[in-house]
């Protein structure tokens, strides 16, 4: 088995809809600092033909730009290929489609390999409930508590949401 959970029981379609980014983690702090390439925020997701389509919000020049990305399915059910700032192997680590999602990416850019993890939730008012699970997954893959950034409303482009 790759990951604590593979894809959701009801299929990837259960991941469709609105999401909110809560926390990021990386072994390369520059990637998730303000203006870092992976300081991006989920807006919504949808699934089609086994691929994951995401609308993400990217802070740029004081504004937030919405960008659509597709993570393409692979032979492994919880692994996807994503081209964004290099090549990413994207893994779904823990999935509860009604409440939270933890994913991590192994990013390869030029000759550099980095690890980035992302916690997203359906309901922002419950974000504290899922931070311990995120910290646990991060620790398990070698990311420590001091490498986690918990996002604020200002961070996550709340003003750019529909």
């Amino acid at each position: 088995q790759e990951g604590n959970h593979e894809e959701p029981q009801g299929g990837l379609e259960e991941l469709s809809g609105r999401w909110h980014s809560v926390a990021l983690a990386s072994n390369k702090s520059d990637l998730i600092k303000p203006w870092g390439h992976f300081r991006v925020f989920i807006h919504s997701m949808s699934a089609k033909d086994g691929n994951l389509h995401g609308d993400i919000l990217i802070p740029q020049d004081g504004q937030c730009e919405k960008v659509s990305l597709t993570a393409f399915k692979t032979a492994t059910s919880n692994k996807f290929d994503l081209e964004y700032w290099g090549h990413n192997d994207l893994y779904l680590a823990e999935v509860d489609p009604k409440s939270y999602l933890i994913l991590y990416m192994i990013n390869q850019y030029n000759d550099d390999t980095s690890l980035v993890a992302h916690l997203m939730v359906r309901d922002l008012s419950r974000q504290q409930d899922f931070l311990p699970a995120f910290e646990s997954v991060c620790e398990d893959i070698g990311l420590h508590k001091d490498q986690i950034v918990v996002l604020s409303d200002d961070d996550r482009c709340q003003g750019s949401r529909d």
């Epitope: 088995q1 790759e2 990951g3 604590n4 072994n27 893994y91 680590a93 991590y104 192994i106 390999t113 690890l115 997954v137 620790e139 398990d140 893959i141 070698g142 990311l143």
Partner: nanobody
Framework: EVQLVESGGGLVQAGGSLRLSCAAS????????MGWFRQAPGKERVFVST????????NYADSVQGRFTISRDNAKNTVYLQMNSLKPEDSAVYYC???????????????WGQGTQVTVSS
Amino acid sequence: EVQLVESGGGLVQAGGSLRLSCAASGRTFSEYIMGWFRQAPGKERVFVSTISKSGAITNYADSVQGRFTISRDNAKNTVYLQMNSLKPEDSAVYYCAAGPLLSPAGRQYDYWGQGTQVTVSS
């Protein structure tokens, strides 16, 4: 300092199976991500599989996905690589490695074993 010793290699026919073991001694085994890499003659050492500290999360190279299974027993300070449906192209020296980060990049691993030879005949 962590010492790693691989075992379980050998000669096997195509389609056969082998189970490699890597015994660790030294610092706390459960604090390390563990990985397997391989190196065929005249080629670079390449990633095979990696496993998280608890064993809950595993990653594989595309070439071995579905045929190889990595696992670990933290009580025994040992990581395993079960290799099924072996092919001649799986022939290589297999190395066990320990490091701080789940990664396919060899340079992320601090400690390496001496390797065990796997030969798959057709």
